[in-house]
């Protein structure tokens, strides 16, 4: 079953996914999709890389890690309850049925309410704004480019690490970050 990750409304969510290129710069196409991994490709693609670069992304979704070293972990900016659900990270290894597929479950919790200082019985509560994500068409039918001849030595989602988005944000903020898109 899929590994579960958590974030609060308004935070950035972090979904880890890694692979080790056989040689530096010898990259494998990767796609991220909203929804469980299908038989082929990714459904409802939110971000895609090719052998060289990020070639497709949608707003609020980006890679903060060094994807050229195989860190293709997804960051989702300013999450809402509508971002809850399963996400697919697919490492598109050349060859028939070689893809590595990882289903990651994102659980969004309502933001913690911090009451303002109150006098007598008056109080103020902060209600997070409810937003909806825009729908994606059937982008799964398209494919771009060809696949390189490459062998992978390791693929891992680090299932037992970086499960907490706050920890992930701390780690991310401790070093230089490059926002793509």
């Amino acid at each position: 079953s899929e590994v579960e990750y958590r974030a609060e409304v308004g935070q950035n969510a972090y979904l880890p996914c890694f692979y080790t290129p056989a040689a530096p710069g010898n990259l494998v196409p990767v796609c991220w999709g909203k929804g469980a991994c299908p038989v082929f490709e990714c459904g409802n693609v939110v971000l895609r890389t090719d052998e060289r670069d990020v070639n497709y992304w949608t707003s609020r979704y980006w890679l903060n890690g060094d994807f050229r070293k195989g860190d293709v972990s997804l960051t989702i900016e300013n999450v809402t309850l509508a971002d809850s659900g399963i996400y697919c990270c697919r490492i598109q290894i050349p060859g028939i049925m070689n893809d590595e597929k990882f289903n990651l479950k994102l659980v969004i919790k309502p933001a913690k309410v911090t009451p303002a200082p109150t006098r007598q019985r008056d109080f103020t509560a902060a209600f997070p704004r409810m937003l909806t994500t825009r729908g994606h068409g059937p982008a799964e039918t398209q494919t771009l480019g060809s696949l390189p001849d490459i062998n992978l030595t390791q693929i891992s989602t680090l299932a037992n690490e970086l499960r907490d988005s706050r920890l992930a944000n701390d780690l991310r903020d401790s070093g230089a970050t490059i926002r793509i898109g």
Partner: antibody, heavy 116, light 107 residues
């Protein structure tokens, strides 16, 4: 308008060969996965094979592996299914369709009958 | 291989009625499910993908729901052109598989 038109079906003896064609129009053929699905009389639809354009990866259901070959000719916007060593159980209407996981649209189908 | 089972095999309804077609997977397929309509002598037509997303040009009276192993296609108010064969299809597990179909006929 997106359109797929199959041809090449017919009557063939067991062990024989047939080549099905699918002419595509109305979309950028070279960027899409393409698929063959068949429907035997009174049976459910069966996914047969598909091809990833660009990468060229080809996938087959076990029952046709080694006997059927899927291919494309992007210059002609055409999809093909070369069927060798045909068996009676290959008798079906063969549809070409656009897509990898779900299929839209489909052609009208071409009937393949394998019988002696 | 994942077995997709549709019920009922035949559904007899009148125009204007609400039709509910069921599809069950032998193991979880998440939301990776499509519905197709097929009329005699015609190719299947995609109605729903992702369990609940209507394909382009499909009327709003068609809706899909469910996740995991249990799915439903609902036609809110049957029109004469809706009487046909309906198939579900999973695309989570290799190989892609279809249900045996539900025939929706006029009562």
């Amino acid at each position: 308008e997106v359109q797929l038109v199959e041809s090449g079906g017919g009557l063939v003896q067991p062990g024989g060969s047939l080549r099905l064609s699918c002419a595509a129009s109305g979309f950028t053929f070279s960027t899409y996965w393409m698929t063959w699905v068949r429907q035997a009389p009174g049976k459910r639809l069966e996914w047969v094979a598909n091809i990833k354009q660009g990468g060229g990866d080809k996938y087959y259901v076990d029952s046709v592996k080694g006997r059927f070959t899927i291919s494309t000719d992007n210059a002609k916007n055409s999809l093909y299914l070369q069927m060798n060593s045909l068996r009676a159980e290959d008798t079906a209407v063969y549809y070409c369709a656009r897509g990898s996981n779900w299929f839209d649209p489909w052609g009208q189908g071409t009937l393949v009958t394998v019988s002696s | 291989e994942i077995v997709m089972t549709q019920s009922p095999a035949t559904l007899s309804m009148s125009p204007g009625e609400r039709a509910t077609l069921s599809c069950r997977a032998s193991q979880s397929v998440y939301d990776n499910l499509a519905w197709y309509q097929q009329k005699p002598g015609q190719a299947p037509r995609l109605l729903i993908y992702g369990a609940s997303t209507r394909a382009t040009g499909i009327p709003a009276r068609f809706s899909g729901s469910g996740s995991g192993t249990e799915f439903t296609l609902t036609i809110s108010s049957l029109q004469s052109e809706d009487f046909a064969l309906y198939y579900c299809q999973q695309y989570t597990h290799w190989p892609i598989t279809f249900g045996q179909g539900t025939r929706l006929e006029i009562k």
